[in-house]
């Protein structure tokens, strides 16, 4: 299903419906509002909630990818969508949840015998009458992947964190992305005011390691907003 890492019950597939009252079995209202929200809780019912727009997968969370909630040939606004679980359809690696990758249009597990290092993306296009059609997916773009047997070490080029060895994440470095160490307790981290703002960083830091969260350093509470120092701290 479309669950996200932010909340085991979170769904982020589509913008919110415009409606209010829930349509449910037994009611005459044929509507299903309160579904498919980017970010946060799966069943938010805030009518004016705005999905987070994005331009590329890297601007979204680790369990998200960036795409337009459209049929493919239409130019909708791209938003962060929840990753696809194993055995579900995909068109590129970033669509699959961590620990999986896209193979032959299906998210499959990145088992120990098939770790990915570098990734070759092949985009094939052919055009139909009024829309482009591609490799079994109408009006959509597909990609194929080349498999490698080792996970990226520190400094290796990567596409997403699952391409990197344990203890590393995939983060931007200049205009490419490389495997960098996951942050440890006490290390400086970047706290983004708006989800996805890390897309603008030239030198992107990894996230904090397990059991840690990026919070304002206690002795910096009095500092101005612009100079607040965030570090990885125990929950």
């Amino acid at each position: 299903t479309l669950n996200s890492v932010l909340n085991s019950n979170a769904i982020k597939n589509l913008p919110p419906p415009l409606g209010g009252a829930a349509g449910h079995p037994g009611s005459a209202v044929s509507a299903a509002p309160g579904i498919l929200y980017p970010g946060g809780n799966k069943y938010q019912t805030i009518d004016n909630y705005q999905p987070y727009p994005c331009a590329e997968d890297e601007e979204c969370g680790t369990d998200e990818y960036c795409a337009s909630p459209t049929r493919g040939g239409d130019a909708g606004v791209q938003i962060c969508l929840a990753c696809r679980k194993r055995r579900k359809r995909c068109m590129r690696h970033a669509m699959c949840c961590p620990g999986n990758y896209c193979k032959n249009g299906i998210c499959v597990s990145s088992d120990q015998n098939h770790f990915r290092g570098e990734i070759e993306e092949t985009i094939t296009e052919s055009f139909g009458n009024d829309h482009s059609t591609l490799d079994g997916y109408s009006r959509r773009t597909t990609l194929s992947s080349k498999m490698y047997h080792t996970k990226g070490q520190e400094g290796s080029v990567c596409l997403r964190s699952s391409d990197c060895a344990s203890g590393l994440c995939c983060a931007r470095h200049f205009w490419s992305k490389i495997c960098k160490p996951v942050l440890k307790e006490g290390q400086v981290c970047t706290k983004h005011r708006r989800k996805g703002s890390h897309g603008l960083e030239i030198f992107q830091r990894c996230y904090c390691g397990e059991g840690l969260s990026c919070r304002i350093q206690k002795d910096h509470h009095q500092a101005s907003n612009s100079s607040r120092l965030h570090t990885c701290q125990r929950h």
Epitope: L18, A32, R71, G72, K88, R139
Partner: antibody
Framework: QLQLQESGPGLVKPSETLSLTCTVS??????????WGWIRQPPGKGLEWIGT???????YYTPSLKSRVTISVDTSKNQFSLKLSSVTAADTAVYYC????????????????WGQGTLVTVSS | SYVLTQPPSVSVAPGQTARITCGGN??????VHWYQQKPGQAPVLVVY???DRPSGIPERFSGSNSGNTATLTISRVEAGDEADYYC???????????FGGGTKLTVL
């Protein structure tokens, strides 16, 4: 709350064109994140998707009806319409308009808001 | 064209669990959606993307999808659950929406 309402003649003669309009209220038909579709249900039978339109005018039709179907949109009136030509008794059905949500890259397409439907009978 | 196969009818006693199946070639890789339709009413979405429920849909409604069969499960069935249930997928190869033939749930 978003509401969809079908309107049009309840009786159409064979070989003529069936014309229905769906008026959307409580939300804009021009949203880039939604599609608008037509589904029909012959009496006592199952649901059959007819086609879908995007506010930009992109259309998607079921293959079996493609040669006879035209779906159009009028964003200024917040309406979309269905035309089905050369109708026969087999086209007698309850016609529903609905809002469609789609993420083609993930092969997800479904309908979350429906009109109450309008019965169209094809008879001379 | 992708075909979805549903049993025409399923009967269950109140308080019991009803399971409505939807068969399709390798349907486990597809995202399956379920609608409930009561007589004289429009369909209502009860489960989307295999197992997710819209708000307002009771937790008694759940879905699963694996291999060649998707299943809508209704636990603690009530008289008000009596309705027709339709599964639906999107046939990406042909770019069109496909509905199953529908299953009539009868509460004994």
């Amino acid at each position: 709350q978003l509401q969809l309402q079908e309107s049009g003649p309840g009786l159409v003669k064979p070989s003529e064109t069936l014309s229905l309009t769906c008026t959307v209220s409580g939300g804009s038909i021009s949203s880039s994140n939604y599609y608008w579709g037509w589904i029909r249900q012959p009496p006592g039978k199952g649901l059959e998707w007819i086609g879908t339109i995007y506010y930009s005018g992109s259309t998607y039709y079921t293959p079996s009806l493609k040669s006879r179907v035209t779906i159009s949109v009028d964003t200024s009136k917040n309406q979309f319409s269905l035309k089905l030509s050369s109708v026969t008794a087999a086209d007698t059905a309850v016609y529903y308009c609905a809002r469609e949500r789609a993420i083609a890259v993930a092969a997800i397409v479904f309908f979350d808001y429906w009109g109450q439907g309008t019965l169209v009978t094809v008879s001379s | 064209s992708y075909v979805l196969t549903q049993p025409p009818s399923v009967s269950v006693a109140p308080g019991q669990t009803a399971r409505i199946t939807c068969g399709g070639n390798n349907i486990g890789s597809e995202s399956v959606h379920w609608y409930q339709q009561k007589p004289g009413q429009a369909p209502v979405l009860v489960v989307y993307d295999d197992s997710d429920r819209p708000s307002g849909i009771p937790e008694r409604f759940s879905g699963s999808n694996s291999g060649n069969t998707a299943t809508l499960t209704i636990s603690r069935v009530e008289a008000g659950d009596e309705a027709d249930y339709y599964c639906q997928v999107w046939d990406s190869s042909n770019d069109h929406v496909v509905f199953g033939g529908g299953t009539k749930l009868t509460v004994l």
